[in-house]
Interface confidence: low
């Protein structure tokens, strides 16, 4: 439906508190490295126009997308060529290419100094002081550094934010009742932005074709009693707001992601029996628990797929007649019976039945020809078991800081030309997956792991996509979104790999490592062993362990030393000449 | 199917003390980090204290630094909480949980600490 004014709709939709705040996430997402002030500036101007507008939808300028006056606004910056050089290009461009061009130009791995918490004190008197500035910090600091990051989910956690510092800034101690509460945001909000981000890739990527996919396959799993109209119907709703927040639309993709909870909540007696609690939250709550509600139970005496799909006369007809429809109908049917498997499973078997009726009904004898497709399919499944065993049983061995070793290693050794730090923050995340995962039942421990899987080689993706160095790494990352993981793990050592020089440097450490916390004293360790391997691509697993070992003895030594830069001086030398004696370096 | 079974609490004397034990059952117990937490009644939930997998690391809200120890057997698969020289403010009942998530675990063990 069209409205004169698309500024006002919105803003009228939403109210001015979510107006502004989505408006601050855009433009924060879009210029990554303006100073808070700016923005604030730039949205208060925005809103008081916007202001205008649900006024008189008539006045001037009120008629135009919203494209163009936030593009408009963000081009008046003053310092755009020197702070983001040929971004400012993309000023003389008109829409819709000037705000692709915005796009293309968000930064993954922007250059912005590591958030760092302040006491708690000095957060609860800022928190006090300004409430609303303390807020929109926060929503500003988490936007430049995830410019994908879901807008209407960053809303939610800024009120839990808000929540946090409410209730703990007035509890007798404060530490205790804040901190694990803002390391859990942390944490989730690093998760929540990371499956964004391959939300947005896919989308991206491989086209709408693949999300609508992956939306069928993870919705039918989820909803497994409602029909597949009304799975459909989700589908195309979560499809369009998920490309609009990828998109930058993010205004639409709040609003049209509240229409989409209120019919799911109206609907929720043919979708989900799950979904009542989440029904009776708050907008942002609902959302978010709708996003996270547990799969529903199976229906009871669920047909054979074989009869409608290989069994079936009419298998060639169908497909013909609506390719797209059946082969939707196929994975919706499998992933309703199948929640122990991952969503990218499902989608490899989806594909290698789509392919088999490609072959076969073109063949003499077509259902001759397809009879056994579901013979192909096991292969499928039981390599992603097997590998999850597999690991599990290394994890459970080694526990998470170990198992994250053995996979630096493994991922080193696979693809040493990607820079360390995101070796190390790749290979990091890539471990946590046991202790997200293997602690499940077998039947659940498919769709955690390999689901997460795909999130975090999705980062490596993004990450290397911005400075490709290693042609192994864009081939598993370009050809097939389902079989990313398949094809990292099917990759050996790489032999045309020139070992790095020995420096020295790389080895010298100082002490300050001791005042460090255990997370970031391991990353520091982990990077040494990243650039081991890197200098000594053929070490052994022992010959790794025995420097390791040595490594964090020397650390363990000098951090109880009277003199620790003397002692990890002196002690340091010692420790590289031990080391390339065992390495043979 | 992961469970987690707290016991020993219990009415105790303002200044008493009281071993809390958390039984851990369908995962792999020694992998993982643990907590305490505790909810009062009519509070939100508050962290108690942390242990990490090992054993060797533990960390303690200030309100029961120096009066409460975590410690874990991982060949029992048992978390513990040993609570001396206990207050009145101490009454809660008591979750133990994976990780250092302030989110309940089991049903609880209420501690209730009068005269």
């Known amino acids: 439906d069209a409205h004169k004014s698309e500024v006002a709709h919105r803003f009228k939709d939403l109210g001015e508190e979510n107006f502004k705040a989505l408006v601050l996430i855009a433009f924060a997402q879009y210029l990554q490295q303006c100073p808070f002030e700016d923005h604030v500036k730039l949205v208060n101007e925005v809103t008081e126009f916007a202001k205008t507008c649900v006024a008189d939808e008539s006045a001037e300028n009120c008629d135009k997308s919203l494209h163009t006056l936030f593009g408009d606004k963000l081009c008046t910056v003053a310092t755009l060529r020197e702070t983001y050089g040929e971004m400012a290009d993309c000023c003389a461009k008109q829409e819709p290419e000037r705000n692709e061009c915005f796009l293309q130009h968000k930064d993954d791995n922007p250059n912005l100094p590591r958030l760092v918490r302040p006491e708690v004190d000095v957060m609860c008197t800022a928190f006090h002081d300004n409430e609303e500035t303390f807020l929109k910090k926060y929503l500003y600091e988490i936007a430049r550094r995830h410019p994908y990051f879901y807008a209407p989910e960053l809303l939610f956690f800024a009120k839990r934010y808000k929540a946090a510092f409410t209730e703990c800034c007035q509890a007798a101690d404060k530490a205790a009742c804040l901190l694990p509460k803002l390391d859990e945001l942390r944490d989730e909000g690093k998760a929540s932005s990371a499956k964004q981000r391959l939300k947005c890739a896919s989308l991206q990527k491989f086209g709408e074709r693949a999300f609508k996919a992956w939306a069928v396959a993870r919705l039918s799993q989820r909803f497994p009693k409602a029909e597949f109209a009304e799975v459909s119907k989700l589908v195309t709703d979560l499809t369009k707001v998920h490309t609009e927040c990828c998109h930058g639309d993010l205004l639409e993709c709040a609003d049209d992601r509240a229409d989409l909870a209120k019919y799911i909540c109206e609907n929720q007696d043919s979708i989900s029996s799950k979904l009542k609690e989440c029904c009776e939250k708050p907008l942002l709550e609902k959302s978010h628990c709708i996003a996270e509600v547990e799969n529903d139970e199976m229906p009871a005496d669920l047909p054979s797929l074989a009869a409608d799909f290989v069994e079936s006369k009419d298998v060639c007809k169908n497909y013909a007649e609506a390719k797209d429809v059946f082969l939707g109908m196929f994975l919706y049917e499998y992933a309703r019976r199948h929640p122990d498997y991952s969503v990218v499973l499902l989608l490899r078997l989806a594909k290698t039945y789509e392919t088999t009726l490609e072959k076969c009904c073109a063949a003499a004898d077509p259902h001759e020809c397809y009879a056994k497709v579901f013979d192909e399919f096991k292969p499928l499944v039981e390599e992603p078991q097997n590998l999850i065993k597999q690991n599990c049983e290394l994890f459970e061995q080694l526990g998470e800081y170990k198992f994250q070793n053995a996979l630096l290693v493994r991922y080193t050794k696979k693809v040493p030309q990607v820079s360390t730090p995101t070796l190390v923050e790749v290979s990091r995340n890539l471990g946590k997956v046991g202790s997200k995962c293997c602690k499940h039942p077998e039947a659940k421990r498919m769709p955690c792991a390999e689901d997460y899987l795909s999130v975090v080689l999705n980062q490596l993706c993004v990450l290397h996509e911005k400075t490709p160095v290693s042609d192994r790494v864009t081939k598993c990352c370009t050809e097939s979104l389902v079989n990313r993981r398949p094809c990292f793990s099917a990759l050996e050592v790489d032999e045309t790999y020139v070992p790095k020089e020995f420096n020295a440097e790389t080895f010298t450490f100082h002490a300050d490592i001791c005042t460090l916390s255990e997370k970031e004293r391991q990353i520091k360790k982990q990077t040494a062993l990243v650039e081991l391997v890197k200098h000594k691509p053929k070490a052994t697993k022992e010959q790794l362990k025995a420097v390791m070992d040595d490594f964090a003895a020397f650390v363990e030594k000098c951090c109880k030393a009277d003199d620790k830069e003397t002692c990890f001086a002196e002690e340091g030398k010692k420790l590289v000449a031990a080391s390339q004696a065992a390495l043979g370096l | 199917e992961v469970q987690l079974v707290e016991s020993g609490g219990g009415l105790v004397q303002p200044g008493g003390s009281l071993r809390l034990s958390c039984a851990a059952s369908g995962f792999t117990f020694g992998s993982f980090g643990m907590s305490w937490v505790r909810q009062a009644p009519g509070k939100g939930l508050e962290w108690v204290s942390a242990i990490d997998s090992g054993g060797a690391d533990t960390r303690y809200a200030e309100s029961v630094k120096g009066r409460f120890t975590i410690s874990r057997d991982n060949s029992k698969n048992t978390l513990y909480l040993q609570m001396n020289s206990l207050r009145a403010e101490d009454t809660a009942v008591y979750y133990c949980?994976?990780?250092?998530?302030?989110?309940?675990g089991g049903q609880g063990t209420t501690v209730t600490v009068s005269s």
């Open positions: 949980t994976i990780g250092r998530s302030a989110s309940r």
